[in-house]
Interface confidence: medium
C-alpha cells in the first residue's frame, strides 16, 4: 500500500532502520551518534544555503522478539518487519537509511513498491548490484571483483611482469559479514571473476589451505582470503610455505596498517593485503574515537548517508523540484558529495567508489608499503612502489603457475 | 580455553614506573584484540590500552603519552608499560582478549568484547 511520506512543507524526515540484525555488531547508540552528527551538519549546510528548512531522523527499532541472532542470518524478515511497521504508522520520510544485511536489502527491495530511496551502510553482496534506487556507501563485492580481474591481468608493471588466470579462494563459512559476501561473489560461476579466469578453486578446509602451501602439485600460486591478519595466522600459523606462493588478504576496512608503530609480522611476508585507503580525519574524530577500524567505516557510512541525503536535498530544493517523486528516488547515484571525509563518490548504480590499496610487507623495514592503488571509479591500477623489497625472486611477484614462462 | 596470567603488578611512588606482563597459552598474533582494562575501588571496570590484530594501538585519553601496550609473539606475552604513574592509576589491572572477529565483527572497546580474562593484578600508586 502507498505509504504518505513526511517530506514536504518545509519539513523533511529521514527513516533510519535500527535493526538487531546488523552486518557488524555495533551499538545502535553509536549508529544514533552518527546520524545526529549527519543532521547537525546538514542543518547547517542548508542553513548556509539560505534554505530555511527542518530535517529530523526517525529511527525505527525493531521488538528483537523475533529476529535476535544478532548477525545477517535472520535479518531477512526483520527488515520487512520493520517496513511494515513503518507503513502502519504512517511514518515514512523521504529516505530509508539501513538496512546493511544483504539478506534483508535483497528482500525488502524486492517486495515494496519502491517510490524512496534507500541507502545502505553495507548490502555487500552481488544479489543487491544494480538496484535503481538502492545506494551502498561501502565498498560491495563487484568493486573487488573488478579490481582482481584488473590486476591478475595486469602484466606490465616492473614487479608484475606476468598475467595470472588462476586462484584458489580461502572460504571456511566463519568469516565476518563484509568478508561472506566479497567471498561469494568470487565463489560464485556465473561471476566476472569466475568468467575471467582458467582456474579456481575454493578452498574450504584448514587442511586444504594449508596442504596447497607446499603442494608441487598445486594448479595455483595466487590464494585469496578475506580477514585480518590474525585470521590468517590461525590458518598458517609459522608454516613453510613455497617461494611462489602469493597470499591476497582481503581486508578493505582496517586501517591499522597505516599506523605508524604497526610493524608486520614475519609470517606476513608472503602476503598482499588489500585494503581501503584511510580517510584523513577519522582517527581523531568525535563519534569514532572509540570504534575499531571496522566500526568506523560502519558508521562513518551512516553519517554519509545523512550527509547525501542533504546534498540531494539541497539540490532539488534550489531547484524547486517535488522531492516525493521518482525522479528524487532514482537521482541518488552518478555524483560526488561533500562527505564527512571528504567527497565521496557514487558510481551510475549507486555504489561507492573508493581507492583500494595493495599492500606488501617491506623485507628491509618490516613495515607495510603501498605497492599500488587501484581507482573503483575507472577500474584502473596506478602503481606506487617500481622497486619493492619483495620477499619474491627478483623483487618480482611469481608467475601464477609454477614453471610456466613468460605470458 | 585461553589461559590469561598477569603479573607485574605492585606498589610505587607517584611519578614512577611499572610494566605488566601477561603471558598467554596462544601466540599474540593469532589474537583478534587484546586490551587491559583496570577496576579502581567503586568503580567500572575501564579499558586503558587495547592492541588490534594488525598491531594498532588504542589508549584512554587518560594514559596517553604514559602507557605503552605490546606484544611479544615469541614469548606469548603481551605487556603494558606504564610511566609517569599517578595515583588516580591505582587499581587492578585485567588483560582480556578475544580470540576472532566473529561473524559479525567486534569493536573491542567493552568489556562484553572479550571472552578470555585474567585473575588480575593490583597497581597502587601513593603521593
Known amino acids: 500500500s502507498q505509504v504518505s511520506q513526511n517530506c514536504h512543507n518545509g519539513s523533511y524526515e529521514i527513516s533510519v532502520l535500527m535493526m538487531g540484525n546488523s552486518a557488524f555488531a555495533e551499538p545502535l547508540k553509536n549508529l544514533e551518534d552518527a546520524v545526529n552528527e549527519g543532521l547537525e551538519i546538514v542543518r547547517g549546510r542548508l542553513q548556509n544555503a539560505g534554505l530555511n528548512v527542518t530535517v529530523n531522523a526517525t529511527f525505527m527499532y525493531s521488538d528483537g522478539l523475533i529476529h535476535n541472532s544478532g548477525d545477517c542470518r535472520s535479518s531477512t524478515c526483520e527488515g520487512l518487519d520493520l517496513l511494515r511497521k513503518i507503513s502502519n504508522a504512517q511514518r515514512m520520510g523521504c529516505v530509508l537509511i539501513g538496512p546493511s544485511c544483504t539478506y534483508s536489502t535483497f528482500q525488502m527491495y524486492l517486495d515494496t513498491e519502491l517510490s524512496y530511496p534507500m541507502i545502505s551502510a553495507g548490502s555487500f553482496g552481488l544479489s543487491c548490484d544494480y538496484k535503481e534506487t538502492l545506494t551502498r556507501l561501502m565498498s560491495p563485492a563487484r568493486k573487488l571483483m573488478y579490481f582482481l580481474v584488473n590486476f591478475w591481468k595486469t602484466n606490465d608493471l616492473p614487479f608484475k611482469t606476468y598475467s595470472w588466470s588462476t586462484s584458489y579462494v580461502y572460504k571456511n563459512g566463519t568469516e565476518t559479514e563484509d568478508c561472506f559476501w566479497y567471498l561469494n561473489a568470487l565463489e560464485a560461476s556465473v561471476s566476472y571473476f569466475s568468467h575471467e579466469l582458467g582456474f579456481k578453486v575454493v578452498l574450504r578446509q584448514d587442511k586444504e589451505f594449508q596442504d596447497i602451501l607446499m603442494d608441487h602439485n598445486r594448479k595455483s600460486n595466487v590464494i585469496i582470503m578475506c580477514g585480518g591478519p590474525e585470521f590468517l595466522y590461525k590458518l598458517k600459523g609459522d608454516r613453510a610455505v613455497a617461494e611462489d606462493i602469493v597470499i591476497i588478504l582481503v581486508d578493505l576496512f582496517n586501517d591499522q596498517y597505516f599506523e605508524d608503530n604497526v610493524t608486520a609480522p614475519d609470517y606476513m611476508k608472503n602476503v598482499l593485503v588489500l585494503t581501503l585507503s584511510p580517510g584523513n580525519s577519522l582517527l581523531n574524530s568525535s563519534f569514532s574515537r572509540n570504534l575499531s577500524p571496522t566500526k568506523r567505516d560502519f558508521a562513518l557510512a551512516y553519517l554519509n548517508g545523512i550527509l547525501l541525503f542533504g546534498h540531494m536535498l539541497k539540490i532539488f530544493l534550489e531547484n524547486g523540484e517535488n522531492i516525493t517523486t521518482p525522479k528524487f528516488a532514482h537521482a541518488f547515484r552518478n555524483l560526488t558529495f561533500e562527505g564527512y571525509d571528504g567527497p565521496v563518490t557514487l558510481d551510475d548504480w549507486g555504489d561507492v567508489d573508493s581507492t583500494m590499496v595493495l599492500l606488501y610487507t617491506s623485507v628491509d623495514t618490516k613495515k607495510y608499503k603501498v605497492l599500488l592503488t587501484y581507482d573503483t571509479h575507472v577500474n584502473k591500477t596506478y602503481p606506487v612502489d617500481m622497486s619493492p623489497t619483495f620477499t619474491w625472486k627478483n623483487s618480482k611477484l611469481p608467475n601464477d603457475i609454477t614453471g610456466r614462462g613468460p605470458q | 580455553q585461553m589461559q590469561l596470567v598477569e603479573s607485574g603488578g605492585g606498589s610505587v611512588q607517584s611519578g614512577g614506573s611499572l610494566r605488566l606482563s601477561c603471558a598467554t597459552n596462544?601466540?599474540?598474533?593469532?589474537?583478534?584484540?587484546m586490551a587491559w582494562f583496570r577496576q579502581a575501588p567503586g568503580k567500572a571496570r575501564e579499558r586503558v590500552a587495547a592492541?588490534?590484530?594488525?598491531?594498532?594501538?588504542r589508549y584512554a585519553d587518560s594514559v596517553k603519552g604514559r602507557f605503552t601496550i605490546s606484544r611479544d609473539n615469541a614469548a606469548k606475552t603481551f605487556a603494558l608499560q606504564m610511566n609517569s604513574l599517578k595515583p588516580e592509576d591505582t587499581g587492578t589491572y585485567y588483560c582480556?582478549?578475544?580470540?576472532?572477529?566473529?561473524?559479525?565483527?567486534?569493536?573491542?572497546?567493552?568489556?562484553?568484547?572479550?571472552?578470555?580474562w585474567g585473575q588480575g593484578t593490583q597497581v597502587t600508586v601513593s603521593s
Open positions: 582480556a582478549t578475544r580470540a576472532d572477529a566473529g561473524r559479525w565483527g567486534s569493536a573491542c572497546t567493552t568489556e562484553l568484547d572479550f571472552g578470555n
Open positions: 596462544e601466540p599474540p598474533y593469532s589474537i583478534y584484540c
Open positions: 592492541i588490534l590484530n594488525a598491531g594498532g594501538t
